[in-house]
Structures are given as structure tokens and as C-alpha cells.
Interface confidence: low
């Protein structure tokens, strides 16, 4: 009796079970009663990453420099090319089809987490006692200068955007 289901890595065709092509190879012809499934390796710019019965391999992803992309990992016959973003850019989406510049943290905010190729800069407000006077994609909030340790006094209070201003102590005559 002809099979109604096949084992793993097989497929049912013309009432018989044929072997699937292994990753990196495409189907040329189905098996017959007398011959095995015929498969051919994908060409250099193509891949198939599963056991399959595809008659065409998939084209490797193109890491388009116009989109700020570069190759992170070159594709093989069994894997797709992995793109990442150029320095200073990160992916717009999980599939990394294009890149955008890292956000800078505005004055009053510091970098909590520096951007990576796949995630943007995470900024945080500078808490009391800290400041940032620059727009930067890598600078953390800096602590106010400690006037006391320099034997000076605070002449102007600090803010989240400015450091304290220290000055000499008024000497008693």
C-alpha cells in the first residue's frame, strides 16, 4: 500500500517517499521507483538553510552601503549574509534593512547605555549632583566638582546642565 506519510527529511510525491535535499542544496528532480532524489549545491551567492524541496536557492541578502549597511557575516550555501550598521549607525528594525544615526543625549541627559549596531543610545536625565553640558552619544552625566576638596566654596550652584562654580573662601580678618 502506498504511504500516506513519510519519515523526517522525506517528502511524499507520486505516492512515494523521496529524500529532501540537505541545506545548501536545491532540488533538481524528484526520486522515482528506481532513482534517488537529485539535488545540486546552491551557487556562491545563494543559500538554502533547511532540508528542502526548493527548485531555486535564495539570493544572499545584499548589505547596501547606501543604507549604511556592511557585512557582519558572509553568507554560505547554508546561511544568509548577516548585515550590520556602519560605525555611528544602528538598525531601524529587527530585520536590519536600513540604518539610522545613533541618537545623541541632549544637555541635561547622559548616556545610560551606548548604542550598538542594533540598538539606539539610551539616555537618562542627570540626577541632582550630576550634569552634562554637551549633546553626546557616549558621555555619561558627570558629578559636580567638589569645591570642599579643593579648599574652595560654591559660588554658583550646579544644574543638570552646568557644573558648580567654585571660588575662594572669604577670609575673616
Amino acid at each position: 500500500e502506498p504511504p500516506t506519510a513519510c519519515r523526517e527529511k522525506q517528502y511524499l510525491i507520486n505516492s512515494q517517499c523521496c529524500s529532501l535535499c540537505q541545506p545548501g542544496q536545491k532540488l533538481v528532480s524528484d526520486c522515482t521507483e528506481f532513482t534517488e532524489t537529485e539535488c545540486l549545491p546552491c551557487s556562491e551567492s545563494e543559500f538554502l538553510d533547511t532540508w528542502n524541496r526548493e527548485t531555486r536557492c535564495h539570493q544572499h541578502k545584499y548589505c547596501d552601503p547606501n543604507l549604511g549597511l556592511r557585512v557582519q557575516q558572509k553568507g554560505t550555501s547554508e546561511t544568509d549574509t548577516i548585515c550590520t550598521c556602519e560605525e555611528g549607525l544602528h538598525c531601524m528594525s529587527e530585520s536590519c534593512e536600513s540604518c539610522v544615526p545613533h541618537r545623541s543625549c541632549l544637555p541635561g541627559f547622559g548616556v545610560k547605555q551606548i548604542a550598538t549596531g542594533v540598538s539606539d543610545t539610551i539616555c537618562e536625565p542627570c540626577p541632582v549632583g550630576f550634569f552634562s553640558n554637551v549633546s553626546s552619544a557616549f558621555e555619561k552625566c558627570r558629578p559636580w566638582t567638589s569645591c570642599e576638596t579643593k579648599d574652595l566654596v560654591v559660588q554658583q550652584a550646579g544644574t543638570n546642565k552646568t557644573d558648580v562654580v567654585c571660588g575662594p573662601q572669604d577670609r575673616q580678618r
Partner: antibody
């Protein structure tokens, strides 16, 4: 600099649909996004949505979902917006506006606009 | 949706004056604001992006400033060719939204 050439003005009947084209003077659209913007007579600008020519991915303003459909033909570097089931409310000038990937929403380059009049 | 309020629909000015056009966002949009100039019968033209960066070819009498919710476009030494409508745009969040516009006219 990218030039965007839009199709000419159109007079259409209520209930009809129409398609506006936006042809870019670039060898390759890759690396640009194309936004579409509506300007009703004497009024401000409304963002309809954008399409990424690289993969045909679209993002719509919820208000225009079902009203506008954005498509792209990479081979001719032309973007299209189809407007469906037109009413008098859709009479306006429609612009395509493009920007480079490094700031995909800033709309650096604008087409000349396509005037659409919906009237029986 | 984020609303951009350009409270002055019209602003009167004279050639040589300095004028400031304001745009207030209903929530924090950081510096994701652009400014456009539109003359009658023409397409909008990009002037400023990311709140304060001037587009290539835009005269330096146009200056953008602000962050968070309050933004200003300042035109120093106004010229007759600057008489136009000015719109702000936020691109911090979808949907992108424009202000209602400020018309700059002669006194």
C-alpha cells in the same frame, strides 16, 4: 540632489479611485524613504504615510488606512499612491517627499504636488 | 497623536527685522523637529532639521532652536523673499504631524 516629478492634476468623480505617480531622478531609490503628504485648500499639511523603496515596507497614518495605498516600482524609481473611494473631502494637493536614510522622516526633497478635485 | 501648536497664525514684520516663529508640542519630541517654508503655489521647502541643523544652501539668517516641547524658528534681517508660510513637523512618533502654519507678512 533628488528631483521628484509628480503626475498632473486630475478631476475625478465621487466614488472613483485614482493613482498618483512620483518619479525620482536617481539611479537607485535604495537608501531613500518616500513620504506622502496631503494639503487641503488653504490648510496645513497632513502626513499620509511612507514607503521604504528598499523593501516596499509601508507605515500609514491610521487616518488614511483604507483611503491610500502606497506602492513602489524600484526598476523605474517611481512611487505611487492610490486613493480609493474618493469624496469631496479628498480634494486637495498631494505631495510626495523624499529623504535620505540618515534622517528618514525629515522630507528633504518635495515633488511639485498633484492637485486632485473630486466633483460630479 | 502629537499636536504641534503654532499659536500665531499671522506675523507682521518689516524688511530688516528679526522675527521668531514658535511651535509647541503636546509632548516631548526631543529634537525631532523640522521647519519648512512654503510660498503660494509652491511645494514646501526644508529649512531646518533636528531642531537646529540648517539644510545645505539655506541662508544663515534662518536659525532653529529648542528641544523637548518648545521650538523656535528665528529669521534675522528678514528679506522680502522670506514672506511665506512656515510649518513645523515632528518626526519623533507616528503619525508624523505638522503645525497649522504661521504666515509671515509685511506690516
Amino acid at each position: 540632489e533628488v528631483q521628484l516629478q509628480q503626475s498632473g492634476p486630475d478631476l475625478v468623480k465621487p466614488g472613483a479611485s485614482m493613482k498618483i505617480s512620483c518619479k525620482a531622478s536617481v539611479y537607485s531609490f535604495t537608501g531613500y524613504t518616500v513620504n506622502w503628504v496631503k494639503q487641503s485648500h488653504g490648510k496645513s499639511l497632513e502626513w499620509i504615510g511612507l514607503i521604504n523603496p528598499y523593501n516596499g515596507g509601508t507605515t500609514y497614518n491610521q487616518k488614511f488606512k483604507g483611503k491610500a495605498t502606497l506602492t513602489i516600482d524600484k526598476s523605474s524609481t517611481t512611487a505611487y499612491m492610490e486613493l480609493l473611494s474618493l469624496t469631496s473631502e479628498d480634494s486637495a494637493v498631494y505631495y510626495c517627499a523624499s529623504s535620505y536614510y540618515s534622517n528618514p522622516y525629515a522630507m528633504d526633497y518635495w515633488g511639485q504636488g498633484t492637485s486632485v478635485t473630486v466633483s460630479s | 497623536d502629537i499636536v504641534l501648536n503654532q499659536s500665531q497664525k499671522f506675523m507682521s514684520t518689516s524688511v530688516g527685522d528679526r522675527v521668531s516663529i514658535t511651535c509647541k508640542a503636546s509632548q516631548n519630541v526631543h529634537t525631532a523637529v523640522a521647519w519648512y517654508q512654503q510660498k503660494p503655489g509652491q511645494s514646501p521647502k526644508a529649512l531646518i532639521y533636528l531642531a537646529s541643523d540648517r539644510r545645505t544652501g539655506i541662508p544663515d539668517r534662518f536659525t532653529g532652536s529648542g528641544s523637548g516641547t518648545d521650538f523656535t524658528l528665528t529669521i534675522d534681517n528678514v528679506q522680502s523673499e522670506d514672506l511665506a508660510d512656515y510649518f513645523c513637523l515632528q518626526h519623533w512618533n507616528y503619525p508624523l504631524t505638522f503645525g497649522a502654519g504661521t504666515k509671515l507678512e509685511l506690516k
